[in-house]
């Protein structure tokens, strides 16, 4: 039975040219996290494997930095970075937990962080 929940940074916004941290946190389960995948729509951005550490997709190697923790830092943001991001936690024995974050990249300097929320 999957008892865990994923808490994410929720809906967030940031300025063009700036950077943003995407964060997810898995709680309420004792399952072992074997790997976390970060995806943008269907594109794999990065992997954090419990044994092998961080691996960043070549498509994002100049703009993505691992961490903090299991999170991901996106740099040099462009308007094209607007969209859905998913943190996919592969765990044992529970299986897979997925969190969703919506990022809006703004032209102006009125970017504000959204509230945190939970996905069961």
């Amino acid at each position: 039975m999957m008892t865990g929940t994923i808490e994410t940074t929720g809906n967030i916004s940031a300025e063009k040219g700036g950077s943003i941290i995407l964060q997810c946190h898995l709680s309420s389960t004792t399952a072992q996290v074997t790997q976390v995948n970060w995806e943008q729509q269907d594109q794999l951005l990065a992997i954090c494997n419990a044994d092998l550490g961080w691996h960043i997709s070549p498509s994002f190697k100049d703009r993505v930095a691992p961490g903090p923790g299991l999170g991901l830092t996106l740099q040099s943001l462009t308007v094209n970075d607007t969209g859905e991001y998913f943190c996919i936690y592969h765990t044992y024995p529970d299986g897979t937990y997925t969190g969703r974050i919506f990022l809006e990249v703004l032209e102006s300097s009125v970017a504000e962080h959204g509230a945190r929320f939970q996905i069961p």
């Epitope: 594109q43 794999l44 992997i47 494997n49 044994d51 092998l52 691996h55 960043i56 997709s57 070549p58 498509s59 190697k61």
Partner: antibody, heavy 118, light 107 residues
Amino acid sequence: EVQLVQSGAEVKKPGESLKISCKGSGYSFTSYWIGWVRQMPGKGLEWMGIIYPGDSDTRYSPSFQGQVTISADKSISTAYLQWSSLKASDTAMYYCARAAWWQGFDHWGQGTLVTVSS
Amino acid sequence: SYELTQPPSVSVAPGQTARITCSGDALGDKYASWYQQKPGQAPVLVIYEDSKRPSGIPERFSGSNSGNTATLTISGTQAEDEADYYCSAKDASFNSVFGGGTKLTVL
């Protein structure tokens, strides 16, 4: 110690089938990709395809798609490369190698020499 | 299909710097790796993810990758560095391709 041990040399006739193997040891077999690389006599390296034994996700080079099949049995930490109908042009040394995601192939098998001749 | 182009041969005097290039369309958007192969032996990884060096590989080996060109640099080349060198590119979907290879001769 990380090791990839490949099956022995094979001599086959055109039209015959073949399955060669690559057994991994000394590491978590399901955490790394296993790739297959062809080297024809006196020629360069050619990437054939790759498999992730953890979930059997497989990618092929367009040049080898439909010509060979890559598979893995994670219960015995072994990857396979097989042909249903060999051609003389399949004569080559075949290497298996492991890679962590986007990293390069950091450990290689010793190679399996396949000779196809009538 | 994607192709990588290397010079067939490069010569260098002992102690000098050897540079082997690898070119491909938007190669800088992929990860470049470099392999050394000596006669009768399996290849050995000398550079991965553009510029990282595996443990056990001497510091004289370095790599870079931007635009359409990846470069393997061997500083203070030694006789034992004489070998064939292959570049490889890996894209976001884990697909790879090798260059045609460069024979490095240490004069």
